[in-house]
Interface confidence: medium
C-alpha cells in the first residue's frame, strides 16, 4: 500500500515537472510572440480557422462585403508592406470604389485616427501612370490628390479621407486586403 502511494506521489511529481516545463515553454513562446505579435496571431488564426472554418475573416481582420482588411500595427516601407501582406495570402489594399474608400477611412478613424497607411498603388517609373498591384488603373476619382515632390519612386497611401502620394521608401502603417471566406453552409 505504501509503495502504491509513493508510486502515485512520484507520478504526480513527474506530472508537475512536465507542467512546469510546458508553462516555461509557453512563457518563452509568449515572449517571442510579443515580438512578432502579428505573425503569431496569423498563425493562431490559421490553426483556428482550419479547425472551425466558420468566420469569413481571420481574427483581427475587418470584414466589409466580400473583403477582409488588416490594419497593421507596425511601420514599414511600401515594398516591405507588400511582402508582409503576401505572407498572409493577401495584397496591399486595392480601393475599387468610393464606398470602399468611405468604409476604410471610417474604420481607420475608429481604430487609430489620422495616420498614414500604404495601399497597393504605385506610379510607373516610365509612363508616370498610377497602377494597382494587379496591374489595373485606378478609377479617376481614386487618384492620389497630390503629386509627391520626391525624385524617387512614388507610392500611394491613405490618410484621413484622402488618397495621397509619397516616396515609397518612407515608413508608414499599411492595410492588407483578401477575399472573405464564402460560407460553405
Amino acid at each position: 500500500k505504501l509503495l502504491q502511494v509513493s508510486t502515485i506521489a512520484m507520478q504526480q511529481q513527474e506530472k508537475l515537472i512536465q507542467q512546469e516545463r510546458a508553462l516555461l515553454n509557453f512563457t518563452e513562446w509568449k515572449r517571442s510572440c510579443a515580438l512578432q505579435m502579428k505573425y503569431c496571431q496569423a498563425f493562431m488564426q490559421n490553426s483556428l480557422s482550419s479547425a472551425h472554418n466558420s468566420s469569413p475573416c481571420p481574427n483581427n481582420w475587418i470584414q466589409n462585403r466580400e473583403s477582409c482588411y488588416y490594419v497593421s500595427e507596425i511601420w514599414s516601407i511600401w515594398h516591405t508592406s507588400q511582402e508582409n501582406c503576401l505572407k498572409e495570402g493577401s495584397t496591399l489594399l486595392q480601393i475599387e470604389s468610393k464606398e470602399e474608400m468611405d468604409f476604410i477611412t471610417g474604420s481607420l478613424r475608429k481604430i487609430k485616427g489620422s495616420y498614414d497607411y500604404w495601399v497597393g498603388l504605385s506610379q510607373d517609373g516610365h509612363s508616370g501612370r498610377w497602377l494597382w498591384q494587379d496591374g489595373s488603373s485606378p478609377s479617376p476619382g481614386l487618384l492620389p490628390a497630390e503629386r509627391s515632390q520626391s525624385a524617387n519612386q512614388v507610392c500611394g497611401y491613405v490618410k484621413s479621407n484622402s488618397l495621397l502620394s509619397s516616396n515609397c521608401s518612407t515608413w508608414k502603417y499599411f492595410i492588407c486586403e483578401k477575399y472573405a471566406l464564402r460560407s460553405s453552409v
Epitope: H79, E83, L86, S122, Q133, G135, Q153, C168, S169
Partner: nanobody, 116 residues
Amino acid sequence: QVQLQESGGGLVQPGGSLRLSCAASGTSFSINGMAWYRQAPGGQRELVGGITSDGSTGYADSVKGRFTVSRDNAKNTVYLQMNRLKPEDTAVYYCGTSTPRGDSYWGQGTQVTVSS
C-alpha cells in the same frame, strides 16, 4: 528593364497537377517578393499566392493546401505547383513582382484549363 516569362500552362483533367514557372531577368531577383495571380474570363485578376524575399509564402484561401509557391534564386525562377486542380482554377496565370522602389512588373501570362 525587368522581364518575367511564365510557362507550364496547359489542359489538365480535374484532380490533376501542373507546375508553372516564371523566369525573371533584369532584376536583383532574390530581394523581390514574387506573386502569382490569375484571371478567369470576365473576372478580376486575383492573388493566388506569393513568396517573399526571405522565403515566406502566403496563399489565397481558395488554393491553400493545394498550391505551393517556391523559388530558385540561382535560376531567377519562381514556381507554382498546382495539385488537385478544379474546373474553377481555369484562368490565365500571371507572375508579378514589385521592386523595392515600388515599380510593378508582369509576365504575359500562361493559360491553365481544367476540364474533363
